[in-house]
């Protein structure tokens, strides 16, 4: 988790002088509770936005937006703590909005936004906005939380972000798989424009089962420059096992930008359709 290295972060708006500060996620009001605390945020919304760094890289960011309740507690509102928690790693990053002037009611509901938390493709987060000061130990909570799911690199907008492109999102191998005679599969795919090796992982399954009955790995050496964007054709020999008929072919590239962690592409061959009634055997065999 990190903040976008963007120009100076601002939270000021007409009628409010405000500054954004790094936070330890442990506001002073936890340790020194105040008697009067503001109410919780209203209508917290989290959306996926995209932002460029100063270097021109494009990253997915969490766009956080919320409004204030229209009660007198805004007179005691000194700021807000924004927290993003990556659910699996338990990594948390916080910033603090520090209000440098008192809030006053005005004709519009107060609205705040922040779009500088960089998020990772295909990851899950919890976003929390805490109004400051935080409540006394038994006081009503004055925060609102929402979970946030970042799409993976297959998502159209995500595909062109720097982290996705680094993992090979622009490569479309256009895999085709055909079943040949004598228990063989012919796999064809388009090579990317990089001299790197590939691995084909074949996993076979019985018709309605998810436990594999055959596995095979095939190494493809790095192509020469003149072979970039060309089709690579590989014939794989299957084990002759009755009913082991559903085949998943996965192609793993080893691009320099992502090494062992590049996006994999796969294609599946289903078991042949079984006719409802067996075909009758003809009484005679035609000679032509």
């Amino acid at each position: 988790l990190r903040l976008l290295d963007h120009r100076a972060l601002v939270c000021s708006q007409p009628g409010l002088n405000c500054t954004v500060k790094n936070s330890t996620c442990l506001d002073d009001s936890w340790i020194h509770p105040r008697n009067l605390t503001p109410s919780s945020p209203k209508d917290l919304q989290i959306q996926l936005h995209f932002a460029h760094t100063q270097q021109g890289d494009l990253f997915p960011v969490a766009h956080i937006e919320w409004t204030l309740q229209t009660d007198a507690s805004i007179l005691y509102l000194e700021g807000a703590e924004l927290s993003v928690l990556q659910l699996n790693t338990n990594e948390r990053l916080c910033v603090r909005f520090e209000f440098l002037s008192k809030l006053r009611h005005h004709h519009r509901r107060w609205r705040f936004t922040f779009s500088h938390f960089v998020v990772d493709p295909d990851q899950e987060y919890e976003v929390t906005v805490h109004h400051l000061p935080k409540p006394i130990p038994d006081g009503d909570p004055n925060h609102q939380s929402k979970n946030f799911l970042v799409p993976d690199c297959e998502h159209a907008r995500m595909k062109v972000t720097t982290p996705c492109m680094s993992s090979g999102s622009l490569w479309d191998p256009n895999i085709t798989v055909e079943t040949l005679e004598a228990h063989q599969l012919r796999v064809s795919f388009t090579l990317w424009n990089e001299s790197t090796h590939y691995q084909i992982l074949l996993t076979s399954f019985p018709h309605m089962e998810n436990h594999s009955c055959f596995e095979h790995m095939h190494h493809i050496p790095a192509p020469r420059p003149e072979e970039f964007h060309q089709r690579s054709n590989v014939t794989l020999t299957l084990r002759n096992l009755k009913g082991c008929c559903r085949h998943q072919v996965q192609i793993q590239p080893f691009f320099s930008s992502c090494l062992n962690d590049c996006l994999r592409h796969s294609a599946t061959v289903s078991c042949p359709e079984m006719p409802d009634t067996p075909e009758p055997i003809p009484d005679y065999m035609p000679l032509w």
Partner: antibody, heavy 116, light 107 residues
Framework: QVQLVQSGAEVKKPGASVKVSCKAS????????ISWVRQAPGQGLEWMGW????????NYAKHLLGRVTMTTDTSTSTAYMELRSLRSDDTAVYYC?????????WGQGTLVTVSS | DIQMTQSPSSLSASVGDRVTITCRAS??????LNWYQQKPGKAPKLLIY???NRESGVPSRFSGSGSGTDFTLTISSLQPEDFATYYC?????????FGQGTKVEIK
């Protein structure tokens, strides 16, 4: 091929404990958390909680607090769910599923029957 | 906890029919909703995540829409393998709660 393979069916007496395992393969185990969901016979799905495979952090359904424990063994890419003080209404198929917010891969389920 | 209410609880349809299942949340959940399909004796299968994103490998006849409190799963042309029970699930706030399910039966 991502797979979650669960342990076999169990029959337990009321008051006993059960521990269900869920072995993951086909992906980096510590990249995605594991959630547990159960389904009583003929009923809908009920979220039980989750465990972070990276940090070991857990989040349990309120009504199961004190009775459920979720753990992982990263060396074997296996998640475990233990439920104690079993009651007849704990009879259900218990599923593990990958991730916290969208359950994109599921185990085949483990039937736990609680009967005296 | 956020309550999820599906309707109808069951429906009968024929192959080729357009089928619509709705799910209503007890409070605003943005687009934090998934749809699952479950066949008897099998684990659920993810169809749609974040209200409208089709999971990889799911046929294009399945689509999801909605935001806020009202959501819809549509099967544009019902196939024989689509007869199953469908569940919605919200993940805006924990605990992640499921709808009670909609059983799609053959007419």
């Amino acid at each position: 091929q991502v797979q979650l393979v669960q342990s076999g069916a169990e029959v337990k007496k009321p008051g006993a404990s059960v521990k269900v395992s869920c072995k993951a393969s086909g992906y980096a185990f510590s990249r995605f958390g594991i959630s547990w969901v159960r389904q009583a016979p003929g009923q809908g799905l009920e979220w039980m909680g989750w465990i972070s495979t990276y940090s070991g952090n857990t989040n349990y359904a309120k009504h199961l607090l004190g009775r459920v424990t979720m753990t992982t063994d990263t060396s074997t890419s296996t998640a475990y769910m233990e439920l104690r003080s079993l009651r007849s209404d704990d009879t259900a198929v218990y599923y593990c599923a990958r991730r916290f917010l969208k359950f994109d891969y599921w185990g085949q389920g483990t039937l736990v029957t609680v009967s005296s | 906890d956020i309550q999820m209410t599906q309707s109808p609880s069951s429906l009968s349809a024929s192959v080729g029919d357009r089928v619509t299942i709705t799910c209503r949340a007890s409070q605003d959940i943005d687009s934090s909703l998934n749809w699952y399909q479950q066949k008897p004796g099998k684990a659920p299968k993810l169809l749609i995540y974040a209200a409208s994103n089709r999971e990889s490998g799911v046929p294009s006849r399945f689509s999801g829409s909605g935001s806020g409190t009202d959501f819809t799963l549509t099967i544009s042309s019902l196939q024989p393998e689509d007869f199953a029970t469908y569940y919605c699930q919200q993940w805006a706030n924990m605990p992640g709660t499921f709808g009670q399910g909609t059983k799609v039966e053959i007419k």
